[in-house]
């Protein structure tokens, strides 16, 4: 902490300007009024202060606002935001999307820091839900943002916000997250026609149940292999050879290249070899002719 020393004569700051970069730390502490700093925060960003000097400015704001900074100051923090700790940010009440954007801009190009994560958490909790504008903003800065949320947090996303989601935003989502997002997407896109619906829903299909995949197989959707490989194993396994053929359309030939990979491998093993042979792809490993097909999973679960 900086010692309290009197400001040298003639050095009292009347405004926040470039002359302050020549002030020593103790001079900044003594000669810059915290209230002045708060009202002229927008100027700080344009001045090349050292990290040590920024520490002093932060200290002054902390003293002025021990309960947390007002939004008028937060919006203009600029690079001073990088000096904030998650504990500092938890004291804030950020309600304006413009404030959020301004602070995210400071961290742009970097991974999501604990400070940014705390800021977003405070903002979203303050709003009560992840509305479309917020989601648009967050995924623009952090494409992986959606997949960083827990299934519980995702449940607060309204279906209307799903329109803001791009395929790349779902790249790192796991099955539990897609299980939550898929029904919302289904609801959001329900009024679209077949081919348009498929284009929109495709990225969310990692959360689709078997019944929905069966329904899609009747709609000539021609699902690509990359999407098929991301489907839930338990959703793929009950599909028949005919259903998979219809689901993939011309892409069915790609099964050969994926036959050692899941979920294709698991699916092949459950099909009759006779049925696999009808595809003409040389897929091997199906149930031999004359074999009794047993599914004891339910029986075992009950015993």
């Amino acid at each position: 902490e900086v010692e309290k020393t009197a400001c040298p004569s003639g050095k009292k700051a009347r405004e926040i300007d470039e002359s302050l970069i020549f002030y020593k730390k103790w001079e900044l502490e003594a000669c810059v009024d915290a209230a002045l700093l708060a009202t002229q925060m927008d100027r700080v960003n344009a001045i090349p202060f050292t990290y040590e000097q920024l520490d002093v400015l932060k200290h002054k704001l902390d003293e002025l606002y021990p309960q947390g900074y007002p939004e008028s100051v937060i919006q203009h923090l600029g690079y001073l935001f990088l000096k904030m700790s998650p504990e500092d940010i938890r004291k804030w009440n950020v309600t304006s999307l413009e404030t959020l954007k301004a602070l995210l801009e400071v961290n742009k190009g970097h991974e999501m820091s604990p400070q940014v994560a705390t800021l977003i958490d405070r903002f979203v909790k303050g709003r009560g839900q992840l509305d479309k504008d917020t989601l648009d903003t967050l995924t623009a800065f952090y494409p992986g943002y959606l997949c960083s949320l827990s299934p519980e947090e995702l449940s607060s996303v309204p279906p209307s916000s799903i329109w803001a989601v791009r395929p790349q935003d779902l790249d790192t989502c796991d099955p539990r997250q897609l299980d939550v997002l898929y029904p919302k997407a289904r609801l959001a896109f329900q009024n679209m026609n077949g081919s348009e619906y498929f284009v929109k829903i495709q990225s969310f299909l990692g959360g689709a149940p078997t019944e929905d995949l069966k329904a899609l197989s009747q709609q000539n959707v021609s699902m690509d292999l990359a999407t098929f490989m991301k489907l839930r194993t338990d959703a793929v396994l009950p599909l028949t050879v005919a259903e998979v053929q219809k689901l993939l359309g011309p892409h069915v030939e790609g099964l050969k290249a994926e036959e050692r990979h899941r979920p294709v491998r698991d699916w092949i093993l459950r099909q009759r070899q006779d049925d696999l042979d009808t595809l003409g792809l040389g897929l091997q490993g199906g149930i031999p002719n004359g074999y009794l097909v047993l599914d004891l999973s339910m029986q075992e679960a009950l015993s």
Partner: antibody, heavy 119, light 106 residues
């Protein structure tokens, strides 16, 4: 509750064939949700997947061991077996049989049996 | 074969610590990643499957996450019974394991 138990000789001579059997109790091998798996662990080292078999008889082997490995299933005895030919001292390890659930992972394991290759 | 690079190979921690172990796949494996715990002289036990799903009976202090081909196992507050070795395993193609991480008492 399903349990697995490995059995077989604890000492095998170099160049001979290592043979182990895993007995499944409390459940059926004839279940399309499972792969019946063999895994080994060299002393103080990590885990190495040897291969697995599906109830229909389809097998999958570790490419580095494929030429020496045979896994078979006897559904009537609720057993599956491992044969590893032309063994050397490098095959000395704890051998585990395990059940892999297609929806989860290796959810049931045997307690493991130590096999030493030595003359 | 798909290589799984696990780190660190060992770590020292105290009861109550937050512990993070990572595994990187040499290519995309979607979510086909499991985590196991192994205590000396015992067979491994399944903790997490499909990258983030908790196996039945496993305490909620264990969690898993994925970012692309990087996977993380987190123990939120280490308990005395958690000192053990941990392994990741991919099952997307022929299964392979990470080299393991030994969690020891600091």
């Amino acid at each position: 509750q399903v349990q697995l138990q490995e059995s077989g000789p604890g000492l095998v001579k170099p160049s001979q064939t290592l043979s182990l059997t895993c007995t499944v109790s409390g459940g059926s091998i004839n279940n399309n949700n499972y792969y019946w798996t063999w895994i080994r662990q060299h002393p103080g080292k990590g885990l190495e997947w040897i291969g697995y078999i599906y109830y229909s008889g389809s097998t999958f082997y570790n490419p580095s061991l494929k030429s020496r490995v045979t896994i078979s299933v006897d559904t009537s005895k609720t057993q599956f077996s491992l044969k590893l030919s032309s063994v050397t001292a490098a095959d000395t390890a704890v051998y585990y049989c395990a059940r892999e659930d297609t929806m989860t992972g290796l959810d049931v394991w045997g307690q493991g049996t130590t096999v030493t290759v030595s003359s | 074969d798909i290589q799984m690079t696990q780190s660190p190979s060992s770590l020292s921690a105290s009861v109550g610590d937050r512990v993070t172990i990572t595994c990187r796949a040499s290519q995309s494996i979607n979510n086909y990643l499991n985590w196991y715990q192994q205590k000396p002289g015992k067979a491994p036990t399944l903790l997490i499957y499909a990258a983030s799903s908790l196996q039945s009976g496993v305490p909620s202090r264990f969690s898993g996450s994925r970012s692309g081909t990087d996977f993380t196992l987190t123990i939120s507050s280490l308990q005395p019974e958690d000192f053990a070795a941990y392994f990741c395993q991919q099952t997307y193609s022929n299964p392979t394991f990470g080299q393991g991480t030994k969690v020891e008492v600091k």
